[in-house]
């Protein structure tokens, strides 16, 4: 019964970009300005998203698709469909409630967004620090200390399993 009724529903013939107008005997009317319908058979059109303030228009609204926003320079998108704009920081910083703050010692951020993350602990993989970390860059791990010592055997035993716990680098 449901299938039969849907086949007879005149609204199902209304294409995207139109709506089924109950006030006009269920004929298909075009979406009014600043509205859209992305699928057929709609009884109303949706209001277009407006990209205002820190948002800027990436794609204009059309009768069949919503507008898409991104963020003005100095900000980046967060959330599905760029629902929020968040302030950029510099590399080597992270955004806090009090604004952009430098990464504290032992952490880095190589992007203008996101948080500072701890330097890799090379010793966990039995390796040594080849290049020290900075606020902007992670450490670079190199061979294990045993590999670097003169006259070291070419076959090194596996590093002993560290007891996970307090682990200064």
């Amino acid at each position: 019964f449901e299938r039969t009724r849907s086949l007879q529903d005149p609204c199902s013939n209304c294409p995207a970009g139109t709506f089924c107008d109950n006030n006009r005997n269920q004929i298909c009317s075009p979406c009014p300005p600043n509205s859209f319908s992305s699928a057929g058979g709609q009884r109303t059109c949706d209001i277009c998203r407006q990209c205002k303030g820190v948002f800027r228009t990436r794609k204009e609204c059309s009768s069949t698709s919503n507008a898409e926003c991104d963020c003005t320079p100095g900000f980046h998108c967060l959330g599905a469909g760029c629902s929020m704009c968040e302030q950029d920081c510099k590399q080597g910083q992270e955004l806090t409630k009090k604004g952009c703050k430098d990464c504290c010692f032992g952490t880095f951020n190589d992007q203008k967004r996101g948080i500072c993350r701890p330097w890799t602990n090379c010793s966990l993989d039995g390796k040594s620090v080849l290049v020290n970390g900075t606020k902007e860059r992670d450490v670079v791990c190199g061979p294990s200390p045993a590999d670097l010592s003169p006259g070291a055997s070419s076959v090194t035993p596996p590093a002993p399993a560290r007891e996970p716990g307090h682990s200064p680098q």
Epitope: E94, G106, I115, C116, P118, P168
Partner: nanobody, 116 residues
Framework: AVQLVESGGGLVQPGGSLRLSCAAS????????MGWYRQAPGKQRELVAM???????YYLDSVKGRFTISRDNAKIAMYLQMNSLKSEDTAVYYC??????????WGKGTQVTVSS
């Protein structure tokens, strides 16, 4: 002595979900950032997700949109909700509490296996 204990690991089918928890015992306070790392056999330990004291987060590209990290400061606890799991997520997952460069703590790990 401070100890971190992970729980919630196990065997799950591809597409399934798991929720990992990390709890601290011992005297610990003012944790700047909490993170989940993972290590698959023969691979380096990698940072999967991290949350700082302001609630800012970091996610490994391959888990974005699937994993969600959260923390409960009152309980000194951290969680990792893992959805749409894939075979490549199979690893030992370690929790990590970072107070400073000189003071940070690791859990012993919990095994996550994604297999049909």
């Amino acid at each position: 002595a401070v100890q971190l204990v992970e729980s919630g690991g196990g065997l799950v089918q591809p597409g399934g979900s798991l929720r990992l928890s990390c709890a601290a015992s011992g005297s610990i306070f003012s944790i700047d950032r909490m993170g989940w790392y993972r290590q698959a056999p023969g691979k380096q330990r990698e940072l999967v997700a991290m949350i700082n004291s302001s609630g800012g987060t970091y996610y490994l590209d391959s888990v974005k949109g699937r994993f969600t990290i959260s923390r409960d400061n009152a309980k000194i606890a951290m969680y990792l909700q893992m959805n749409s799991l894939k075979s490549e997520d199979t690893a030992v997952y370690y929790c990590h509490y970072w107070i400073s460069h000189e003071m940070n703590y690791w859990g012993k790990g919990t095994q996550v296996t994604v297999s049909s």
